[in-house]
């Protein structure tokens, strides 16, 4: 997935403000034995800072060695640090774990800018705040990296958690979730909740506060309000959905719904921005313009490059639109839309010259490589990565920042016909396909 | 857009003045803060001085009574007048300004740097 513009995060010291948390609707499912309920141990495992991932503590080897681990869903490889970097506080030594088996085999991941390169082998893996199992997982012990780890992020690895079809060097390397479910009794499903401070964090107060939670195996009731629901996984290689209508303000943005999943659309944690196909962005930033006409931002704003800024606690959020999107829902002709709010979209930031102030950046950008829903989106909501059922889950967010007058919002079921059509097919080219 | 330039820096011996400059162009709307920072290699962006349009400034507490920052409205620019300078004055010095288009609302923007470099 494409380094730079990817990796997320803000965390959660704010949530919903007191009084702001949604009563619980009860018409759910039926529960489901051993994947529902209270997972209290993996609450709030997660943490992370604006921009640069939201990570979970693992301990990999024997003696276990502790390290964080960014959580990435768009990506399917288990790598640590595993040499001394200048931005690393601590790596992978292998020579130090009783457990290591090398695969004596290498593996090159280059991203957009950036790449990390590394060797190959597996060691006992298990997640503190997590199921109470161990694993034996492949991990790629990354010996070379160049704008990968990030300064002051304080991750030191990154877990992939999509399909093995993407895996790096190929689909013959299970992904650790795979592992993880094959070896143990842990249901094959997760659940993220991303929570966004609304504000920027320095360094000990990222350290000190919670960025969220993944429930491993399950889905926890006291993190979501409302309903869960689900769209179908399109394909299992990225987490790959499809969305069939775009609105900002309630006003259709009347597009072929081909354009909103060209040439994919996925649902990514380890990506910052919301991220649309040209046309789309295009469509949408026209939009948004005319919807907060009441000022005027310049094009850097727009691109993503330019800071605008309120003086404390000024912003002016009912100026800037929600915006919805509609993805195919479990019942024929049946979708469901989830819409965010402007605290998702501007990213708060922070400059040494505008401390006392607070400042933004638009995170919605364009894309080469079809929609992506980073943690723009995320953060707004309870993500269920059902797994076993092929479905991906959305819901609001118990933690999600918002204000008086709006709120995030799940809602279904409307009615939109020829939805398979939305899809795009990507041209093979196997060499099956070049000889005909 | 607003566009930054600045202009003045230079190496000079321990002891020694520099002024430096930055004027501001585009879109400007109200250039209501300027200011100067500095940045070394391997830490953070400083606070060096900040001038209101109204004239009102700060300093940091290491160029007080050595640098004073004026502004020229008219011109839509800013000077860093700086004496007795030392070698740990030594950094990139950059220029901000903050563009405001309502009350409260404002654009951020940095110049491209100018190098100081002061000698023993």
């Known amino acids: 997935t494409q380094h730079g513009i990817r990796l997320p995060l803000r965390s959660g010291l704010g949530g919903a403000p007191l009084g702001l948390r949604l009563p619980r609707e009860t018409d759910e499912e039926p529960e489901e034995p051993g994947r529902r309920g209270s997972f209290v141990e993996m609450v709030d495992n997660l943490r992370g800072k604006s921009g640069q991932g939201y990570y979970v503590e693992m301990t990999v080897g024997s003696p276990p060695q502790t390290l964080n681990i960014l959580v990435d869903t768009g990506s399917s490889n288990f790598a640590v640090g595993a040499a001394p970097h200048p931005f690393l506080h601590r790596y992978y030594q292998r020579q130090l774990s009783s457990t290591y088996r090398d695969l004596r085999k290498g593996v090159y991941v280059p991203y957009t800018q950036g790449k990390w390169e590394g060797e190959l082998g597996t060691d006992l893996v298990s997640i503190p705040h997590g199921p109470n199992v161990t694993v034996r997982a492949n991990i790629a012990a990354i010996t070379e990296s160049d704008k990968f780890f990030i300064n002051g992020s304080n991750w030191e690895g990154i877990l992939g958690l999509a399909y093995a079809e993407i895996a790096r060097p190929d689909d013959s390397l299970e992904p650790f979730f795979d592992s993880l479910v094959k070896q143990t009794h842990v249901p094959n499903l997760f659940s993220l909740q991303l929570c966004g401070a609304g504000f920027p964090l320095n360094q000990s107060e990222v350290l000190a506060s919670v960025g969220g939670s993944m429930i491993i195996g399950g889905i926890d009731h006291s993190l979501y309000t409302g309903s869960l629901w689900y769209t179908p996984i399109r394909r299992e290689w990225y987490y790959e959905v499809i969305i069939v209508r775009v609105e900002i303000n309630g006003q259709d943005l009347k597009m072929d719904c081909k354009e909103y999943n060209y040439d994919k659309s996925i649902v990514d944690s380890g990506t910052t921005n919301l991220r649309l196909p040209k046309k789309v962005f295009e469509a949408a930033v026209k939009s948004i313009k005319a919807a907060s006409s009441t000022e005027k931002f310049p094009d850097g704003f727009w691109l993503g490059e330019q800071l605008v800024c309120w003086q404390a606690g000024t912003t002016p959020w009912n100026i800037f639109p929600v915006i919805s999107l509609y993805l195919m829902g479990e019942v024929t002709n049946q979708s469901f839309r989830i819409t965010i709010l402007p605290q998702q979209y501007l990213r708060p930031v922070e400059d040494v010259a505008t401390s006392q102030d607070d400042c933004y950046k638009f995170a919605i950008s364009q894309s080469s490589t079809g929609t992506v829903m980073g943690a723009v989106i995320m953060e707004g909501f309870y993500v269920v990565f059902d797994r076993a059922r092929k479905r991906i889950g959305f819901a609001v967010s118990a933690c999600h920042v918002h204000d008086e007058f709006r709120t995030a919002a799940v809602e279904g079921p409307f009615v939109t016909l020829d939805m398979e059509d939305c899809g795009y097919n990507i041209p093979q080219t196997d060499e099956s396909t070049l000889m005909t | 857009q607003v566009q930054l330039q600045e202009s003045g820096g230079g190496l000079v011996q321990a002891g020694g003045s520099l002024r430096l400059s930055c004027a501001a162009s585009?879109?400007?709307?109200?250039?209501?803060?300027m200011g100067w920072y500095r940045q070394v290699p391997g830490k953070q962006r400083e606070l060096v001085a900040a001038?209101?349009?109204?004239?009102?400034?700060n300093y940091a507490d290491s160029v007080k009574g050595r640098f004073t920052i004026s502004r020229d409205n008219a011109k839509n620019t800013v000077y860093l007048q700086m004496n007795s300078l030392k070698p740990e004055d030594t950094a990139v010095y950059y220029c901000?300004?903050?563009?405001?288009?309502?009350?409260?609302?404002?654009?951020?923007?940095w110049g491209k740097g100018t190098q100081v470099t002061v000698s023993s």
């Open positions: 001038i209101t349009s109204g004239g009102t400034s």
């Open positions: 901000n300004a903050k563009n405001f288009f309502s009350a409260s609302g404002y654009f951020l923007y």
């Open positions: 585009g879109r400007i709307f109200d250039l209501r803060d």
